[in-house]
């Protein structure tokens, strides 16, 4: 028998520095977790103790903090090189700055293979990107070889900016011939490493003949065997065992997100490359693991540029940006409008001639808007200003919801109106009218939404049975502020870009902004 140790990360999302337990900015260092310096300590400890170790990443290193905003992926290549990753799969967020924003900072700088079998380049891009990412790679590990085959969510064109010259094929269809090719090369130990979410990971384990292990990402799935060490609730045991269609037991793993855990899986293979046993658990990277001093010193060196960036002007406002709780928790506020407009603008994807865009709606809990911005400071808006407005380090995500769920959400928005509670919704691409004289749960008297399948966008009444795409904060997607109906009833959830980054990009693009209060939210019968 031959034993392989797979160390894995996924959805790190720019958390190069240690973070608080909830993966936001580290405040009390003695309670902080993750970060590449701490990750390196643990990886090195395992490399020294065990003979056959692979360090893999399942995508979405890009996007999530000011590190990515400033360094645009150069930081990913630099620190992944320093940690000596063996391979990475492309995630959807690796395309956030377009194909060039992937090629230049990452593909050309990585000292490790970057993989995806289901992304096919066409047209002029085909020759330009040839060899920079691969469908699979065979790696020597000790005296054996291991094949690693990559995959990426086929929803990427709706979630990011891969352009028109990359085709995202069905994962299973694309993976099978590559695995078959590895078999003909006498590679009998094959890991599928990819970024399509836990449901697809399980399908790959079930359907793709010859895949021995699946290491996934995208869904931020936390798996654990035994008592979990932090706040995350396991979605299943680690590894999650899938019985393949040809009768094999295939371990499937994922390691939550944000570099909080290091996935640790030990696999025992027989001489024919069959998995005999698999066991392990994600390792919580808490403060009991010291940060590696040389990586930490490097992080501190790279940090200097971030501090300079946060005080530079992004753009100007010529109006007061009202982000006060007195406004945003009670009525339409222009800060809410600005943020929602930025959220929609960030999700412009012309992927179908029938649609002017794939999504037109935004909702945003008023309680998530934490500060106004005064225009009397020469109109200057900085990253620092925006960090006061959106201090929680969240993301603006894409969900699919039924009209009936949206109706419930808007009822919840005003179910206890008047108490300055955070669930009051700010909107974009939605016109809502409330009648507060009616009983809670029956206060939405009009709810019109902006069409997407139209050449001239206009507002139509919400249809209860129709499925709509909506952009919203991850906080709401996860049921925050009492929006349990969103969490329970959402049909799809894809995590998006860092909230501050979305707004800062929009302001930089617009240069001068002047958001108004324009009747998106109204109150009827003189009740307000």
């Amino acid at each position: 028998a031959w034993e392989l140790t797979i160390l894995h990360t996924n959805d790190v999302h720019s958390r190069l520095e240690q973070t608080s337990e909830d993966s936001s900015k580290c405040v009390n260092a003695s309670r902080c977790m993750g970060g590449v310096a701490r990750l390196f300590t643990k990886v090195q400890q395992i490399r020294r103790a065990e003979p056959n170790v692979l360090l893999l990443d399942a995508g979405d290193q890009y996007q999530g903090t000011i590190w990515f905003t400033v360094y645009k992926g150069a930081e990913v290549a630099h620190f992944m090189n320093a940690l000596r990753y063996d391979a990475m799969a492309l995630g959807n967020h690796e395309f956030d700055n377009g194909v060039e924003g992937l090629i230049e900072p990452l593909l050309k700088e990585a000292k490790f293979p970057i993989l995806s079998a289901n992304i096919k380049a066409k047209g002029p891009l085909a020759s330009q990107i040839s060899g920079l990412y691969l469908p699979y790679k065979v790696l020597p590990v000790g005296d054996e070889v291991v094949g690693i085959v990559g995959y990426t969510s086929k929803e990427t064109p709706f979630l990011s900016n891969p352009g028109t010259n990359l085709v995202f094929e069905d994962e299973i269809t694309a993976l099978q011939p590559e695995v078959d090719k590895l078999k003909t090369l006498n590679v009998n130990k094959i890991i599928a490493l990819g970024h399509s979410g836990f449901e697809m990971d399980k399908l790959i384990a079930q359907k793709v003949r010859g895949v021995d292990v699946v290491v996934g990402g995208h869904s931020n799935t936390f798996l654990y065997t035994g008592n979990p060490p932090s706040k995350e609730v396991p979605a299943g045991k680690y590894p999650f065992i899938v019985t393949s269609d040809d009768g094999r037991k295939v371990p499937v793993v994922q390691a939550y997100a944000f570099g909080k855990y290091l996935g640790y899986l030990k696999i025992e293979f027989d001489e024919r490359g069959n998995v005999i046993s698999s066991h392990g658990n994600p390792i919580l990277l808490n403060s009991s693991i010291p940060e590696d001093p040389s990586i930490k010193a490097d992080i501190n060196k790279w940090r200097i540029k971030l501090d300079n960036y946060s005080t530079q002007e992004l753009g100007k406002t010529i109006v007061y940006l009202d982000g006060s709780s007195q406004s945003c928790r009670f009525r339409e506020c222009n800060m809410g409008n600005l943020i929602c407009d930025a959220m929609i603008n960030n999700n412009l994807r012309h992927t179908d001639e029938m649609f002017w865009n794939h999504v037109s709606m935004c909702i945003l809990n008023g309680g998530g808007i934490r500060s106004p911005i005064d225009e009397r400071n020469n109109g200057t808006i900085t990253w620092e200003n925006l960090a006061a407005v959106l201090p929680f380090g969240g993301t603006f995500d894409l969900v699919q919801l039924k009209g009936s769920t949206l109706k419930k959400a808007f009822e919840h928005s005003v179910h206890r109106y008047g108490q300055s509670t955070g669930e009051f919704l700010q909107v974009g691409g939605i016109h809502v009218v409330y009648d507060l004289s009616r009983k809670p749960g029956d206060r939405v008297v009009k709810l019109d939404v902006l069409c997407t399948k139209c050449r001239v966008p206009s507002y139509d009444p919400l249809k209860m049975d129709e499925v709509y795409k909506v952009i919203l904060p991850n906080f709401l997607a996860n049921g925050g502020d009492g929006f349990q109906m969103i969490k329970d009833e959402l049909l799809r959830h894809d995590s998006g870009d860092q909230d501050i980054n979305v707004v800062s990009t929009y302001i930089s693009k617009m240069k001068v902004i002047y958001p108004a209060v324009e009747g998106r939210i109204k109150f009827s019968t003189g009740s307000h």
Partner: antibody, heavy 117, light 107 residues
Framework: QVQLQQPGAEVVKPGASVRLSCKPS????????MHWVKQRPGQGLEWIGE????????NYNENFKSKATLTVDTSSSTAYLQLSSLTSEDSAVYYC??????????WGQGTTLTVSS | DIKMTQSPSSMYASLGERVTFTCKAS??????LNWFQQKPGKSPKTLIY???RLLDGVPSRFSGSGSGQDYSLTISSLEYEDMGIYYC?????????FGGGTKLEIK
């Protein structure tokens, strides 16, 4: 397949400058960095520097900063190494090599530079 | 700069023999080590990258190993065409630096 075409030899007078060329084929020129390496007769190899053809960004060995200048012409898909104020110490074979995963994977045949009056 | 020291500087070996060259870095180079073969009057040919990964088309009798500061290249069964000079290169840190080379000759 990947090939890097370099002229066989150049003879230049001391004090002059020379521009050595490297024309790759078999891959997209701007998609990979290009290394330059010096080898004096009967000696080992010395790394001069590297250039990113898509944006002209360079990294140099400090020992060659005042001697060598790396450039590219994307219209002809050619990389160049310019050497100035030549002395007999600069007589050597100069190789270009494509960078992949950080290291040089494919090498040119080398240009033999002779500095002689 | 990182100094790369190769040993021995030259060696004789018989056909079919197992041959090992070593390369020592002045500091940890994180396995970012290359091995090249150079024949007289020819350009270097890359054999191994990342300390132990064989380039496509390189015969399987070549293998690399090592980590930290110490690395080695092994030819499991020497063939006539293997004679030449073998160089190591670290690409962990700029400037990249080469070892002085090991000259391999057939007995």
């Amino acid at each position: 397949q990947v090939q890097l075409q370099q002229p066989g030899a150049e003879v230049v007078k001391p004090g002059a400058s020379v521009r050595l060329s490297c024309k790759p084929s078999g891959y997209f020129f701007t998609s990979y960095w290009m290394h330059w390496v010096k080898q004096r007769p009967g000696q080992g190899l010395e790394w001069i520097g590297e250039i990113n053809p898509s944006n002209g960004r360079t990294n140099y060995n400090e020992n060659f900063k005042s001697k060598a200048t790396l450039t590219v012409d994307t219209s002809s898909s050619t990389a160049y190494l310019q050497l100035s104020s030549l002395t007999s110490e600069d007589s050597a074979v100069y190789y270009c090599a494509r960078r992949n995963y950080g290291y040089p994977d494919y090498w040119g045949q080398g240009t033999t530079l002779t500095v002689s009056s | 700069d990182i100094k790369m020291t190769q040993s021995p500087s030259s060696m004789y070996a018989s056909l079919g023999e197992r041959v090992t060259f070593t390369c020592k870095a002045s500091q940890d180079i994180n396995t970012y080590l290359n091995w090249f073969q150079q024949k007289p009057g020819k350009s270097p040919k890359t054999l191994i990258y990342r300390a132990n990964r064989l380039l496509d088309g390189v015969p399987s009798r070549f293998s690399g190993s090592g980590s930290g500061q110490d690395y080695s290249l092994t030819i499991s069964s020497l063939e006539y065409e293997d004679m030449g000079i073998y160089y190591c290169l670290q690409y962990d840190e700029i400037p990249y630096t080469f070892g002085g080379g090991t000259k391999l000759e057939i007995k």
